[in-house]
Structures are given as C-alpha cells and as structure tokens.
C-alpha cells in the first residue's frame, strides 16, 4: 500500500486500565502528533481506522467491533471497551487516512488486575496536600466522558482497604474527598469507585491516587544554611585534605527548584584550575522539606588554596542566601628545643 507517516510505538503513552471496567482511549494522533482535531479530519473526508497486535504476537489484526453487547466500539476518535478483558492487552494502532493521506501511531494498552485492597501494577498519580492548612479536596480522577451529566453515579471512597466513613477529618462528598485538616496520618492511597448505569448494565470505574501531606506554604522560609557557619573554622596544613560541607535546609514549596552551589573566589569550581570535587546528598523529612549537603573536597590543599574564599550558595522560590566558610592555614606548632634555647639566651 502507499506510504504512511508512521509515528511508531508511542511508549510515552503507556495506557493502563483495570480488568472488567470500562475504558475510553483517545487516538493519540490528534492530541500529540497532528495539528488538527478529529472533527476537522472527519469533515475533510479522512477515516480513522483501528487495529491491534495482541501481547506476544507480531501479527496486526483488525479490532472486532461485532462482539456481544458491543463490548468494543469506536465513537469519533475514541476506542471504547465496555468492559475490558485481561486479554485485551496489546499494542493498538489508530490510522487516519484517505486516498492521498495517511498517518498512524501505535500505543501500548495494558489491562491490569487489582487485588482486594486495590493494589495493582498501575502507576498512581500523587496529590500533595499541605499540612494543617484548612480544608483541601481531592477529586476522583479520569472519569470525564464515561457517562452523561444527566446520570448521577454512586461514588464510594476507600483509604487502602477501608471504606471512608466516620473518619475524623476526611469526608466523602460525591466525586470529591475533603480533608478538613491534613495530617501526616492522612498519607496513603485513596480509591474512588464510581458506579453508573448504561443501557441496562452497571459499570464501575476504580481510580486510585496517592495522597502525600507536605509542608505548608504558611510555614515556608528561605533556604537556611546550617553549615558552613561562624562556629567552625577549617584549619589545615598544606598537603592535608580539605573537606567543607555545605548543608542547607529547604522548606517544601510546590514546584520550587532547590539549588545549592559553591563558589571559590567568586567562580564556579568548574571554572578554576584547582583539583576540587563536590559530592551531593539529599534527604527529605516526612513533609518533604529537603536537606541538601554538598561536600567540597580538595585532596591536597596548598597554602594558596587556604587563602581562597569558599562560599556556599542556596536558592529556592523563597529566596537566595550565601555563607562563607572560615578557612585558614594552621600555624605550625613551635619547635620546642629551639624555643627553649632562645629562652635561655643561647646562641
């Protein structure tokens, strides 16, 4: 057949759906690859064709749209499963074509099983709540387009295995789950099960997300440099190893980039000729406040190196700070015999 623009297998869109639940999968062509939408394509006389390759097979085959109860159907640019089966797992291709134009993309679809507490191989979205910040809500995700607004679904919320009812600070409110005051104990996986009727059948959508309680912006401060500080002097003799830690505390800030860097005589270490190495380690508190440590190391320090200015810098969305390390050359201890002799006036 004639040439087709093949976007290949789009592994960025690894779609995971639960077994025995409805799934609606939009053709990625219109979302990520083409400059026009399905309606434009359709009105221009282009046809959208679907086919698939089963798991562990090489053979592309058409999708069977004549299954009982229309289990698999296509509506505009959406492929519908009502519901999925485990063996629907495979690579799906949508192809847009007419006699003169052709474009296609494949994507992997994985039908996964959940256990009795909703655990599964599915990658979970993470929703961050600020600690002790007042009422905050999470919303049952990815349920748009499954049923019309005239249908009133039943929603049941769970934390882990347990239905959420009579919880102190967590209240189910339909599609939303309200946290009156988020605490560390609210960390965990939350699942909404949405039940809705369609054409004489009942369907369920299971959606799980991870809640992580993080530091509140009310308590956020600019970076705090714990080390170097005024109490510690790095006194070295030439030839010794110089190790200076820069330890910085960063309050959690949503979407903030935390940075730590050293300057030596006002320059980045990469821009000077001395043999310096910097090792970084990062640790987090339970509320995702961050402590970064960068250890500046010079294996064999020279007397010139001990005269330089070593400054630790830190920056976050809350501000920028800097602190110089106190570095000096160790004064050699006096040689006892000579001093003694001098003291007695010996020549």
């Amino acid at each position: 057949s004639e040439r087709c623009d093949d976007w290949g297998l789009d592994t960025m869109r690894q779609i995971q759906v639960f077994e025995d639940e409805p799934a609606r999968i939009k053709c990625p062509l219109f979302e990520h690859f083409l400059k026009f939408n399905y309606s434009t394509a359709h009105s221009a006389g282009l046809t959208l064709i679907w086919y698939w390759t089963r798991q562990d097979r090489d053979l592309e085959e058409p999708i069977n749209f004549r299954l009982p109860e229309n289990r698999i159907s296509k509506e505009k640019d959406v492929l519908w499963f009502r519901p999925t089966l485990l063996n629907d797992t495979g690579n799906y291709t949508c192809m847009l074509r007419n006699t003169t134009y052709c474009s296609k993309v494949a994507f992997p679809l994985e039908v996964v099983q959940k256990d009795s507490c909703f655990n599964s191989p599915m990658k979970l979205p993470v929703h961050k709540l600020y600690i002790e910040y007042g009422i905050q809500r999470i919303t049952c995700p990815n349920v748009d387009g499954y049923f019309p607004s005239s249908v009133k679904p039943t929603i049941t919320w769970y934390m882990g295995c347990y239905k959420i009812q009579n919880f102190n600070n967590v209240i189910p409110e339909g599609m939303n789950l309200s946290f009156l005051i988020a605490l560390i104990s609210n960390n965990g996986n939350y699942t909404c099960v949405v039940t809705y009727p369609e054409n004489g059948r009942t369907f369920h959508l299971t959606r799980t997300l991870t809640v992580k309680v993080v530091g509140s912006p009310k308590n956020a401060v600019p970076p705090v440099i714990h080390s170097p500080n005024d109490h510690v002097v790095y006194e070295k003799e030439p030839g010794e190893e110089l190790l200076i830690p820069c330890t910085v505390y960063f309050s959690f800030l949503m979407d903030s980039r935390n940075e730590v860097w050293w300057t030596i005589d006002g320059k980045k270490p990469d821009d000077i000729t001395i043999d310096v190495t910097i090792n970084e380690s990062i640790s987090h508190s339970r509320t995702e406040d961050e402590t970064r440590t960068q250890i500046l190391s010079i294996k064999k320090v020279t007397s010139e190196d001990l005269k330089r200015s070593y400054v630790c810098h830190a920056r976050s969305a809350k501000g920028e700070v800097a602190k110089a390390a106190k570095v000096k050359q160790k004064v050699p201890a006096p040689r006892y015999t000579v001093e003694l002799a001098c003291g007695f006036g010996a020549t």
Epitope: D20, P83, S116, T154
Partner: antibody, heavy 119, light 107 residues
C-alpha cells in the same frame, strides 16, 4: 452475559464435610468479590463470607469461621465453599453472589445449592 | 455486628396499592443499604443499592429512601409479579448483614 452456575443438591451425614462450587462466566472472575449466603428453610438470608479470587483474600461472618472455608480457582473461574463438621443446623440453601465491582451489593446470584444433613 | 430489623415479617396488599417496607439498623449506616427481592421459586434479585439507586432493569415503581438508621422500600403501584420476600442489607461495616425479610402477599 454474567452467569453463576452452582453445583447440584447434596445429601450428607452429620459430622461429614461438603464442598459446593460456583462456576462464573461472562466477567473478570479475579477482579470481583464472590460472596456466599445461607438460607435455612423458611428463614431469611445470612451472609457467610466473601473471597477475592485475585489474591485469595477472605472475610467471614464470625459464626461461620471454622465452619466454612472459601477458596477460588482462577484457572476455571470457580469459587468453592467447604462446610465442615455438618449438623442439622447446616441444612440450608447456599447461594453464591457476585459483588458488582467493589461495593458490596450483590448483582448476580447463583441459583442456590440445597445441602441436607441427615443420618 | 450491625443488626438489621424488618419489623413487619409479612404484609398483605391489593394490586395497585402503594406499599412501604421498612428496615432499621442498630447504628447509622451512612446510606450503605441495599434491597433484594426473592421470588417464591427462590431466585434472588438486586432492586436498589446505596439506599435509593435503582438497579438496571428494575421497574421505576420501586424506590428507596432513608438515612441514618431508618430506611424504606416503596412499591408505588403493586403488580402481581411483585409477590415476593424483600430483604434489606447493610454494607457499611463488615460483616454485611441482612434484615429478616418482609413477605408481601396479595389480599
């Protein structure tokens, strides 16, 4: 089309055991809880317990712990209930019933299996 | 365990009547209540889940209501095929428990 097909009636002696089956078809057997319900002649419904075939997790109503054992075979999409140390109190119709999804309402019911305990 | 009580064990009504069957829980069950119909042949069918949601295919003459500990099932226009025993069931807390049932007969 979801179906739950239960095994036939059983006549068993006191003290013996019986294992009844419920074969499921038309849905993802591993991904729904299967419940068992007891109904003594002329009486109401009593929930015995449930099993999640996907991971074998079970919950039992207190009085049925030790009396009933729930298992499931994913390869044949069949749930089983074994009743031990049978007495006349265990003479009843036993239903399997599938949760539709996770919430605990029972949309699909088997036709029931009559167990009669008699010497 | 939560006790479910259906105070009326049997009820007699005429065709076309409006019939209400009540059910009470020993503690609040947050609307986590279902209703089932068991026909004389022993077959069981879900009618209503989550207090008031009509299950697919169930005639609209059936409706459910209630909150807290008190719930009811109403049949607005009794038909011959409604002759059955009706059970409420809570799924607020394990173990799930059923009411004792209300048998509905025609006068």
């Amino acid at each position: 089309q979801v179906q739950l097909q239960q095994s036939g009636p059983e006549l068993v002696k006191p003290g013996a055991s019986v294992k009844i089956s419920c074969k499921a078809s038309g849905y993802g057997f591993s991904s729904s809880w299967m419940n068992w319900v007891k109904q003594r002649p002329g009486k109401g419904l009593e929930w015995i317990g449930r099993i999640y075939p996907g991971d074998g997790n079970t919950n039992y109503y207190g009085e049925f712990k030790g009396k009933a054992t729930l298992t499931a075979d994913k390869s044949s999409s069949t749930a089983y209930m074994q009743l031990n140390s049978l007495t006349s109190e265990d003479s009843a119709v036993y239903f399997c019933a599938r949760n539709d999804g996770y919430p605990a309402w029972f949309t699909y019911w088997g036709q029931g299996t009559l167990v009669t305990v008699s010497a | 365990d939560i006790q479910m009580t259906q105070t009326t064990s049997s009820l007699s009504a005429s065709l076309g009547d409006r019939v209400t069957i009540s059910c009470s829980a020993s503690q609040g069950i947050s609307n986590y209540l279902n209703w089932y119909q068991q026909k004389p042949d022993g077959s069981v069918k879900l009618l209503i889940y989550y207090t008031s949601t009509l299950h697919s295919g169930v005639p609209s003459r059936f409706s459910g209501s209630g909150s807290g500990t008190d719930y009811s099932l109403t049949i607005s226009n009794l038909e011959p095929e409604d002759i059955a025993t009706y059970y409420c069931q809570q799924y607020s807390y394990l173990p799930w428990t059923f009411g004792g049932g209300t048998k509905l007969e025609i006068k």
